[in-house]
């Protein structure tokens, strides 16, 4: 099962990554 | 499981409109985007647009400014695709697909492909 | 634009023997921030919906074969296979996120 660290809750939508600055990276918790 | 299930093939007139519905489940809707991308018969993967859930934002490919339209309910988890004044060259199989927006930007789950025929 | 340019379009391949697709965009795709490369390689068989490979240039998605190597940075990128198995056939294609969405043209990759 794939999770996230964080959430996309505080994220613009931004049209792309060339933008983000921050990464919310997966976590393997299986 | 994550799984992104399309509307049935529709055949249109030239000049009139479609709209391809896509239901996700096994996953939040919202922390997602959704992306829409088509392939007209024999040709290669052409982006349309997207729309991000939980505010509703969209960005769209220039091409298809003003002719496509897309949305999403977040009742429903499903998220909706519309093409305005069809043309014979609309005639492709249109795919949603989930963008692992935030992260990657890429398309980890994709639904069955929705198979829009225009022809008079 | 940011346009993507796949070579070569069609790979006649010998099963167990490496294959090379070279992908290159217009500008680059590297987010100096993050440090990551925002281009992603999808694979679609015969019949099927597109399936995710790569992303971020070189990160194997979830349960994708070994086999499976993404490499480059900036403009130009390469996925490998080491040897070529039956399964591999269809077209493979790499799309920028960097700023919207772009595919190349797709590579036909056939069993000689």
């Known amino acids: 099962v794939k999770s996230k660290i964080g959430s996309t809750e505080n994220l613009k939508h931004q049209p792309g990554g060339g933008k983000v600055q921050i990464i919310n990276k997966k976590l393997d918790l299986s | 499981q994550v799984q992104l299930v399309q509307s049935g093939a529709e055949v249109k007139k030239p000049g009139s409109s479609v709209k391809v519905s896509c239901k996700a489940s096994?996953?939040?809707?919202?922390?997602?985007?959704i992306s829409w991308v088509r392939q007209a018969p024999g040709q290669g993967l052409e982006w349309m647009g997207e729309?991000?859930?939980?505010?509703?934002?969209?960005y769209y490919n220039e091409k298809f400014k003003g002719r496509v339209t897309i949305t999403a309910d977040k009742s429903t988890s499903t998220a909706y695709m519309e093409l305005s004044s069809l043309r014979s060259e609309d005639t492709a199989v249109y795919y949603c697909?989930?963008?692992?927006?935030?992260?990657?930007?890429?398309?980890?789950?994709w639904g069955q492909g929705t198979l829009v025929t225009v022809s008079s | 634009d940011i346009v993507m340019s796949q070579s070569p379009l069609s790979l006649p391949v010998t099963p167990g023997e490496p294959a090379s697709i070279s992908c290159k965009s217009s500008?680059?795709?590297?987010?100096?921030?993050?440090?990551?490369?925002?281009l992603a390689w999808y694979l679609q068989k015969p019949g099927q919906s597109p399936q995710l490979l790569i992303y971020?240039?070189?990160t194997r998605e979830s349960g994708v074969p070994d086999r499976f190597t993404g490499s480059g940075s900036g403009t130009d990128f390469t996925l490998k296979i080491s040897r070529v198995e039956a399964e591999d056939v269809g077209v493979y294609y790499c799309?920028?996120?960097?700023?919207?969405?772009?595919f190349g043209q797709g590579t036909k990759v056939e069993i000689k």
């Open positions: 799309k920028q996120s960097f700023y919207l969405r772009t």
């Open positions: 096994g996953y939040t809707f919202s922390d997602y985007v």
């Open positions: 729309i991000f859930p939980r505010s509703g934002s969209t």
């Open positions: 971020w240039a070189s």
């Open positions: 697909a989930r963008d692992y927006y935030g992260t990657s930007f890429a398309m980890d789950y």
């Open positions: 500008q680059s795709l590297l987010n100096s921030r993050t440090r990551k490369n925002y």
